[in-house]
């Protein structure tokens, strides 16, 4: 039986497809090809001989169709007005023609979306960051990928307005990365550039690691303090020290050669971040034995959490 | 107190290099990064990148990459900065300047600046 | 890279009058702004640094304000001494960027 198979069966806009014609009778003379679902002369694209391979086109030939001697038509830089059904007749020697319909569905072609957003330095726990992926076109499908992924399941993750929006409730440091939209019909798909989202977070409780050198575990007079803290923020925290509460540098590491009695305190790490307006510190006590005794670092280190 | 002394004046001609010092004194050199600046004649005040003395890392403002080399001499407090290919528009005053802590501080202390002259 | 422009380039005041001198950024700066003073002939100093902090020994009669990308150095009532160019800059990572400088002078 006479078949019409559309390759592609969705076309985007300006594109072309292919229909071919499958089982063609042995004893054909001729091919015409019409728009619609019927044979009708108005509706007529273009008939072909084959004894003299010769194609005529018809009242609906619009220039952009090509008939081929395997009866397949080519239609070129098609429109959503091509889309719907064609009817391939093939004329046989003995005047009984076949005829078969196919159809094909034309989709307009996709803009490349681009994002939105509302905020792309949320500060975490504080923030929610809306992301819409622009523009609005119908009978379009919107996916979302992060760093390259498809979206988690997460409940602070919410999509609406026919998934062109995607909303990250009270983010965290973990959602930061890379977001693309992308837009998707039938037969075409287009992805936007990444849009980075920085999520600014900490400064958070900071620790306080010793180095002794020596390096053994107590706090001997004579021995040289290396204290380093450490906070985890973004952007990276300001450093700076307190020895019994007066000020002292604003650096990462504290050090003192040469470490006596004198030097026994509390020594606090504070840490601020201007973009998240968070402040944290740590305080520790340290004693420094004259001799033989070693206390090190007291215990009861503690911190204290500003906002 | 805090000092940062800077190599004198240099005169280069276009296509040459040129190496500038500069010597930190009164506090711990590895603790804190030291940038460098230029200031052409009556211009103002130009990033060019700064050095970790600790670590030896560095970060280069995108017009001098690939041109200026920071190093370092924890043996004697020194920072180095090398500019190569040199013309006419290098001619500046340099200046080292110590950030006045660790990460996104401002320049709190600054050598005395060496003026290097591009001129054939 | 984040721009930086000051105004007015230059100004003429009277010895203790008021004066201002903006900054603005091109992106959100979070505070993270300095000012220097540069005396004819001198090396750059630092006067305020985290947009409003003064470092120590610098005049009480300068001082900082602004948030985000907006910010202003002000003398409360210039003097003889104050005659200089005056920079800002971002201290949020790098690459740091400079204003093009404030001249300030004595009418």
């Known amino acids: 039986k006479l078949t019409i198979e559309s390759t592609p069966f969705n076309v985007a806009e300006g594109k072309e497809v292919l229909l071919l014609a499958h089982n063609l009778p042995q004893n054909r003379i001729g091919y015409s090809w019409y728009k619609g679902e019927r044979v009708d002369g108005n509706s007529l694209i273009v008939g072909y001989v084959i004894g003299t391979q010769q194609a005529t086109p018809g009242p609906a030939y619009s220039g952009r169709e090509t008939i081929y001697p395997n009866a397949s038509l080519l239609i070129q830089n098609v429109t959503q007005n091509d889309t719907g059904f064609y009817t391939l007749q093939v004329i046989k020697s003995d005047l009984v023609n076949e005829e078969a319909t196919g159809q094909f569905h034309v989709y307009p072609e996709l803009p490349k979306p681009s994002i939105s957003s509302n905020n792309s330095n949320p500060v975490e726990d504080k923030d929610a960051v809306a992301f819409t992926c622009e523009p609005e076109v119908q009978n379009t499908t919107y996916l979302w990928w992060v760093n390259g992924q498809s979206l988690p399941v997460s409940p602070r993750l919410q999509l609406s307005n026919g998934n062109m929006t995607l909303t990250l409730l009270s983010v965290k440091r973990n959602d930061a990365g890379s977001y693309e939209c992308e837009i998707q019909n039938p037969a075409s798909a287009n992805r936007s550039d990444p849009v980075t989202l920085n999520v600014l977070y900490g400064p958070d409780v900071p620790t306080i690691s010793p180095i002794i050198s020596p390096p053994d575990s107590s706090y001997l007079s004579g021995a040289n303090l290396n204290l380093s803290c450490h906070s985890a923020s973004n952007p990276s925290p300001q450093y700076s020290w307190r020895i019994n509460g007066i000020p002292q540098q604003h650096t990462q590491v504290l050090f003192i050669a040469k470490i006596t009695p004198n030097n026994n305190g509390t020594y606090a790490c504070f840490v601020s971040n201007l973009a998240t307006g968070r402040n944290n510190s740590i305080v520790k006590s340290i004693t420094v034995s004259a001799s033989g005794t070693s206390p090190g670092l007291s215990a009861g280190a503690h911190h204290h959490h500003h906002h | 107190q805090v000092q940062l002394v800077q190599s004198g004046a240099e005169v280069k001609k276009p296509g040459a290099s040129v190496k500038v010092s500069c010597k930190a004194s009164?506090?711990?050199?590895?603790?804190?990064?030291l940038h460098w600046v230029r200031q052409a004649p009556g211009q103002g005040l130009e990033w060019i990148g700064y050095?970790?003395?600790?670590?030896?890392?560095?970060s280069y403002a995108q017009k001098f990459q690939g041109r200026v080399t920071m190093t370092r001499d924890t043996s004697t407090s020194t920072v180095y900065m090398e500019l190569s290919s040199l013309r006419s528009e290098d001619t500046a005053v340099y200046y080292c300047a110590r950030e006045y802590g660790n990460y996104n501080y401002p320049l709190d202390y600054w050598g005395q600046g060496t003026l290097v002259t591009v001129s054939s | 890279d984040i721009q930086m422009t000051q105004s007015p380039s230059s100004l003429s005041a009277s010895v203790g009058d008021r004066v201002t001198i903006t900054c603005r950024a091109s992106e959100n700066q979070y505070g993270y702004l300095a000012w220097y003073q540069q005396k004819p002939g001198k090396v750059p100093k630092l006067l305020i640094y985290n947009f409003k902090n003064l470092v120590e020994g610098v005049p009480s009669r300068f001082s900082g304000s602004g948030s985000g990308t907006d910010f202003t150095l002000t003398i409360s009532s210039l003097q003889p001494e104050d005659v200089a160019t005056y920079y800002c800059?971002?201290?949020?990572?790098?690459?740091?960027?400079f204003g093009q400088g404030t001249k300030v002078e004595i009418k």
């Open positions: 800059q971002h201290h949020l990572g790098t690459p740091y960027t």
């Open positions: 009164g506090y711990i050199f590895t603790s804190y990064w």
């Open positions: 050095i970790n003395p600790q670590t030896g890392y560095t």
